[in-house]
Amino acid sequence: SPAQRWSMQVPPEVSAEAGDAAVLPCTFTHPHRHYDGPLTAIWRAGEPYAGPQVFRCAAARGSELCQTALSLHGRFRLLGNPRRNDLSLRVERLALADDRRYFCRVEFAGDVHDRYESRHGVRLHVT
């Protein structure tokens, strides 16, 4: 079958109430079939490519475990399995300050060096 292209699928927006939790869905496709090398998953806030990271995890070659390296205030947790092309993120104890746009990003390293980031992101509305 032909190789897939890079793409990312996120909903335009997610709404939740302050104090509750929210899930920010993000799935992706990539052209590197059977890739099982090192992988990093990142979520950033505000703007793509340059906004501050709120979550980052890394998986070693051959591992499904994406070990958390950064979780801002300990409130961000990966629900999706990046090896299954899912970067969905859970945000706990929402505050009004969390009302912003979030962008998911995946990076491959090792034999393959490639990365992709959602350009439009998902808008989190906190009420």
């Epitope: 059977h34 890739y35 051959g62 591992s63 499904e64 475990l65 070990q67 399995n81 299954r84």
Partner: antibody, heavy 121, light 107 residues
Framework: QVQLVQSGAEVKKPGASVKVSCKAS????????VSWVRQAPGQGLEWIGV????????GYNEKFKARVTITADTSTSTAYMELSSLRSEDTAVYYC??????????????WGQGTLVTVSS | DIVMTQSPDSLAVSLGERATINCKAS??????VDWYQQKPGQSPKLLIY???NRYTGVPDRFSGSGSGTDFTLTISSLQAEDVAVYYC?????????FGQGTKVEIK
């Protein structure tokens, strides 16, 4: 051939801790994730958590996170699962399972024989 | 957490007949469902991974299908040695979650 051999059955009192071991052989231990799964008597399967022995990184089911610690010793190719503050509902068979992979697909391809942990006063 | 619901809970099928087990996920899990067989007193064994891929050494009477939220394990011609409990498991989201199991017996 790949083998996962677990420690023997345990009987513990409520509030105590138990540590179950899983000795791997027949493959390069640090390269593959090892998960722990439990099965209460007559019940289904429940994923507890995972370790990547090569890095020591762990991931836990939130349900168990406050009470479980998974470790690995690469010098002896052994993974461990310690569960604290035991209660009667923790009575179960505890399995270790290797997370094998093939062409970018992951799956539990080899399982230990299981360790029965009984919690009773 | 993702809830995996199997149906039926138990199934009695005549030798040589077809057995079909369904598994429904509470949300989209792509094709990331595996099927495991557990015989009495034994550890689970992998049958099918990634919804449709038969694991090494598994007889071709076992097949899997489905994606999204609905998955099926089929035993095309039931043999005596197939008496067991069968579990589906999703690995698209953490924590991994299993169905409650389906017991397959001989009618």
């Amino acid at each position: 051939q790949v083998q996962l051999v677990q420690s023997g059955a345990e009987v513990k009192k409520p509030g105590a801790s138990v540590k179950v071991s899983c000795k791997a052989s027949g493959y390069t231990f640090p390269r593959y994730d090892v998960s722990w799964v439990r099965q209460a008597p007559g019940q289904g399967l429940e994923w507890i958590g995972v370790i990547h022995p090569g890095s020591g990184g762990t991931g836990y089911n939130e349900k168990f996170k406050a009470r479980v610690t998974i470790t690995a010793d690469t010098s002896t190719s052994t993974a461990y699962m310690e569960l604290s503050s035991l209660r009667s509902e923790d009575t179960a068979v505890y399995y270790c399972a290797r997370r094998g992979l093939n062409k970018g697909y992951w799956f539990f391809d080899f399982w230990g024989q299981g360790t029965l942990v009984t919690v009773s006063s | 957490d993702i809830v995996m619901t199997q149906s039926p809970d138990s199934l009695a099928v005549s030798l040589g007949e077809r057995a079909t087990i369904n598994c429904k996920a509470s949300q989209n899990v792509g094709s990331n469902v595996d099927w495991y067989q557990q015989k009495p007193g034994q550890s689970p064994k992998l049958l099918i991974y990634e919804s449709t891929n038969r694991y090494t050494g598994v007889p071709d009477r076992f097949s899997g299908s489905g994606s999204g939220t609905d998955f099926t394990l089929t035993i095309s011609s039931l043999q005596a040695e197939d008496v067991a409990v069968y579990y589906c498991m999703q690995s698209n989201f953490f924590p991994f979650t299993f169905g409650q199991g389906t017991k397959v017996e001989i009618k």
